[in-house]
């Protein structure tokens, strides 16, 4: 199984995302839109606007998800879209709350095996490649709600039913309580709360901060793992360089993570993944001779 794959890569064992954080409200700037003698004003934010075809994409992804996952075919995708829309339409995009998303959370309720959860920070693509091969493990984006919103941006305007395709609040420059940030905070918290037994997290060893307290993982998920359910958090530090044989589990930010986790009465372990390409190959073909012997 996975242990053999780790062994074969000489992975060191040590016992022991979506980006957000900071709180300030921005007012944005007002710019005229439309033509004619009476100007109509639209809020101008610092971030990119709502993804084009946003309503169509969310609805299509929902139906596609239920096609891919027959166990979710009871979901009414029109109701899901209505609840999603209701969370941010006609609301000030700097004043969104977790409460706004509760109807959507309720409709998107899904049971994933609580001991098969893979969290990630700043290394989404590899995490998704891994769960594509290791089909019994799940990232947040493998759940309905994560799948719906992955890589999308959205926001509305106070008191109008319009979606803002021009600009949306930037988390740093404008405000943290924007529709996208609050969505990911809400679903990430719920996902972490659901986890049990051994929880895995994939971290990017090429970043200056391998563990970043300001990432969604560092600011939300770490603090919402339930010590009464979660026995161990196991970090997989993914190396970027071909010849990088350093033990990144000794990195100060990993030690910081270990300290936070230990204080929460959860055990911590860490593994280096020196060759992510080989790691994935061995997950695909564990019987391969190079995956069962030391290399």
């Amino acid at each position: 199984g996975l242990n053999d794959i780790f062994e074969a890569q000489k992975i060191e064992w040590h016992e022991g995302s979506h980006h957000h954080h900071h709180h300030h409200h921005g007012s944005g700037s007002l710019v005229p839109r439309g033509s004619g003698s009476v100007p109509r004003w639209r809020q101008q934010w610092s971030g990119p606007g709502t993804t084009k075809r946003f309503p169509e994409t969310v609805l299509a992804r929902c139906v596609k998800y239920t096609e891919i996952h027959p166990e979710m075919r009871h979901v009414d995708c029109q109701s899901v879209w209505d609840a999603f829309k209701g969370a941010f339409i006609s609301k000030h995009p700097c004043n969104i709350t977790e409460e706004d998303y509760q109807p959507l959370m309720k409709l998107g309720t899904q049971t994933v095996p609580c001991n098969k959860i893979l969290l990630w920070s700043r290394i989404k693509d590899l995490a998704h490649q891994f769960t594509q091969v290791q089909r019994d493990m799940f990232t947040l984006e493998d759940t309905l709600l994560g799948y719906l919103a992955d890589d999308l941006t959205w926001c509305g305007e106070f008191n109008t039913s319009k979606i803002n395709y021009q600009s949306c609040p930037d988390w740093r420059k404008d405000c943290s309580n924007n529709p996208v940030s609050v969505f990911w905070k809400t679903v990430s918290r719920r996902f972490a709360e659901a986890a049990c037994d051994v929880v895995h997290v994939m971290l990017n060893g090429s970043r200056s901060k391998i563990f970043d307290k300001n990432s969604t993982f560092g600011s939300v998920e770490v603090h919402n793992l339930q010590p009464e359910k979660v026995q161990t958090l196991e970090a997989w530090v993914i190396h970027g360089g071909r010849e990088d044989s350093r033990d990144l589990c000794q990195d100060p930010t990993i030690k910081e993570l270990e300290s936070i986790i230990s204080k929460r009465n959860i055990q911590f372990s860490c593994k280096n993944i020196y060759r992510p390409d080989k790691f994935l190959q061995c997950v695909k073909n564990p019987e391969d001779s190079s995956c069962t012997s030391e290399i």
Epitope: R53, E56, T57, A60, R61, V63, K64, E67, I68, P70, H128, Q132
Partner: antibody
Framework: EVQLQQSGPEVGRPGSSVKISCKAS????????MHWVKQSPGQGLEWIGW????????DYAEKFKKKATLTADTSSSTAYIQLSSLASEDTATYFC?????????????WGQGTLVTVSS | DIQMTQSPASLSASLGETVTIECRAS??????LAWYQQKPGNSPQLLIY???SLADGVPSRFSASGSGTQFSLKINSLRSEDVASYFC?????????FGAGTKLELK
């Protein structure tokens, strides 16, 4: 109008590989998963697998896991199936197919089929 | 995997006659069943989805019923253009599976 246009017939030698294409038009390619179905001469239909073009995610029937590889190119709205290590039992017509989202999950749209003949 | 058993394998009928084809699933598939018609040299065409709903453009002489494990397709007032093979398919679970088909010929 939704159309799935498949590439022409292929002849492959035993042990070699072939790659068939299915070009989609009349809809947003990433909004639907694409299925592939095999029909051996004079035989029934066998589901091979699906691909989600938006993410490149795939799923295969156990029987086809080592035989077929599904890929998609969103820039050209084209799905592909590659058949490897060809053997006589791979001689068949291969179809791409898509649901309509309004017709349950039955396949409302089909490509015209591509005949693959394995011959030495 | 869910097995789909279709009967009869072939059948001859006269114009104007009513024809029934049966399909049995090896486990409960609720109403997650489609019926297809395939004429020689053509792709299959969706006739029925969700066990009993008629697909767009399909003549009303085609009807279907059933749920759970027992399903049937009925063709009223058989016409010459109905000569084809008919397949049932379950889409309740992956892998999707098809019946072996029924070849319908004219007497």
């Amino acid at each position: 109008e939704v159309q799935l246009q498949q590439s022409g017939p292929e002849v492959g030698r035993p042990g070699s590989s072939v790659k068939i294409s299915c070009k989609a038009s009349g809809y947003t390619f990433t909004d639907y998963i694409m299925h592939w179905v095999k029909q051996s001469p004079g035989q029934g239909l066998e589901w091979i697998g699906w691909i989600d073009p938006e993410y490149g995610r795939t799923d295969y029937a156990e029987k086809f896991k080592k035989k077929a590889t599904l890929t998609a190119d969103t820039s050209s709205s084209t799905a592909y199936i590659q058949l490897s290590s060809l053997a006589s039992e791979d001689t068949a017509t291969y179809f791409c197919a898509r649901s309509a989202h309004t017709t349950g999950f039955g396949f409302a749209y089909w490509g015209q089929g591509t005949l693959v003949t394995v011959s030495s | 995997d869910i097995q789909m058993t279709q009967s009869p394998a072939s059948l001859s009928a006269s114009l104007g006659e009513t024809v029934t084809i049966e399909c049995r699933a090896s486990e409960d598939i609720y109403s997650n069943l489609a019926w297809y018609q395939q004429k020689p040299g053509n792709s299959p065409q969706l006739l029925i989805y969700d066990a009993n709903s008629l697909a767009d453009g399909v003549p009303s002489r085609f009807s279907a019923s059933g749920s759970g494990t027992q399903f049937s397709l009925k063709i009223n007032s058989l016409r010459s253009e109905d000569v084809a093979s008919y397949f049932c398919q379950q889409y309740n679970n992956y892998p999707y599976t098809f019946g072996a088909g029924t070849k319908l010929e004219l007497k």
